[in-house]
Interface confidence: low
C-alpha cells in the first residue's frame, strides 16, 4: 500500500467482487503507520489518527496493530490486502465491520491485531470480549 502522503491519484469508487459475490470498493481507512499510543487496559480505544486514506487497491481492508513492550505502546493503522500476511499473520477477521483485537504470539511483547471492512473501522479498536458475532449491535452493523 502507498502511504497517503505519497499517493498521487485515487479511484474511490472502484468495484471488486469477492467469492460470495459481495461488491466492494476502495476502503477508507485510518493510515498513520506506527504512532506512540496511550491506549492501555481499556475495552476500546480511538486511534487518534487524523489521516484518512482511500486504500490504493479495492481489495484492501483496514488494519490496526497494538503493541506493548517494556518501553512503550504503539498503534499502527494501515490499509492491507487480506490475501497477504501482515506481520506474518493472516487477516482472519477482514470481513468484520468492526476492528476486534485478537492477541497474537510475539516474543518479547504483547501483540494485538485486528482488521475490518467498513469505512475508517480501524479508528475504533476493540479489546473487549463482549464484542463477538452474537452481539446484536454487531449484527445490526453487518446486516443493516
Amino acid at each position: 500500500t502507498i502511504p497517503p502522503h505519497v499517493q498521487k491519484s485515487v479511484n474511490n469508487d472502484m468495484i471488486v467482487t469477492d467469492n460470495n459475490g459481495a461488491v466492494k470498493f476502495p476502503q477508507l481507512c485510518k493510515f498513520c503507520d506506527v504512532r506512540f499510543s496511550t491506549c492501555d487496559n481499556q475495552k476500546s480505544c480511538m486511534s487518534n489518527c487524523s489521516i484518512t486514506s482511500i486504500c490504493e487497491k479495492p481489495q484492501e481492508v483496514c488494519v490496526a496493530v497494538w503493541r506493548k513492550n517494556d518501553e512503550n505502546i504503539t498503534l499502527e493503522t494501515v490499509c492491507h490486502d487480506p490475501k497477504l500476511p501482515y506481520h506474518d499473520f493472516i487477516l482472519e477477521d477482514a470481513a468484520s465491520p468492526k476492528c476486534i483485537m485478537k492477541e497474537k504470539k510475539k516474543p518479547g511483547e504483547t501483540f494485538f491485531m485486528c482488521s475490518c471492512s467498513s469505512d475508517e473501522c480501524n479508528d475504533n479498536i476493540i479489546f473487549s470480549e463482549e464484542y463477538n458475532t452474537s452481539n446484536p449491535d454487531l449484527l445490526l452493523v453487518i446486516f443493516q
Epitope: D13, I15, A22, L28, S50, S118, D119, E120, L140
Partner: antibody, heavy 122, light 107 residues
Amino acid sequence: EVQLVESGGGLVQPGGSLRLSCAASGFTFDIYAMTWVRQAPGKGLEWVSVISGSGGTTYYADSVKGRFTISRDNSKNTLYLQMNSLRAEDTAVYYCARRGQYRDIVGATDYWGQGTLVTVSS
Amino acid sequence: DIQMTQSPSSLSASVGDRVTITCRASQSISSYLNWYQQKPGKAPKLLIYAASSLQSGVPSRFSGSGSGTDFTLTISSLQPEDFATYYCQQSYSTPPTFGQGTKVEIK
C-alpha cells in the same frame, strides 16, 4: 428504516451563500460516507461531493471545488453542504445520499433524500 | 472524466413490452456500472449495481448486462409503475459520472 431529509434550500442571489443540511436516521451514520448529488431543472444527475464517515476525507467535483464545503456532525447525525459564491448554474435540486458499504452494494448511492431546491437568481 | 452516453434519450412503449436501454462509457469501466430509476419529483432509486446485480427489493423484470464500454438495462415486461427516467452511472473512477438519462413514456 433509513431516512435522509434535506433542508436549507431557497432563493439566493448570485455571489451569495447557503448552507444545506441533511438529517439522517435509521442507520449507523458515522460508519457511512455520504454524498451530495444535484439535478438542475429538467436536466440529469451530477455528483457534487463526498465525505468519509469521520469527516476526515472529502472530495469535490471540479465545478464546485473551492466554493462548496461538505461537512458532517456525527453527534447530530447530520450532513452539511456550505455553498459560497453561488452562480446561476448552481440552481438545482440537491440530494444527499448514502454511499453503500461493501456488504450491501458498490460505492454508489443506495439511499437518497427527497431533495431540496436551490435557486440562484437576481 | 469518464463520459457516459445513453440511448435512446427517450422511448415510447406499452405495458407488457420488452424495453432495452443502452449506456456507453468513453473508456473501459469493466463492470463498474449502476442503473437508477427516477420518477418526476422524486429522488433516484438504485436498480442495478456492478452492471448486473439486482438491488434488494427491485423486481426481477429488471436486469442489467455488459462489460467494458457497453451496457444494457432491460425491462422484460414493462409495468405501469416503470414509466420513468433511467440513468446509468459509472463508479470506476472519481468523479462518478452519470449518463444523460432515458425517459420511458407511455405509447
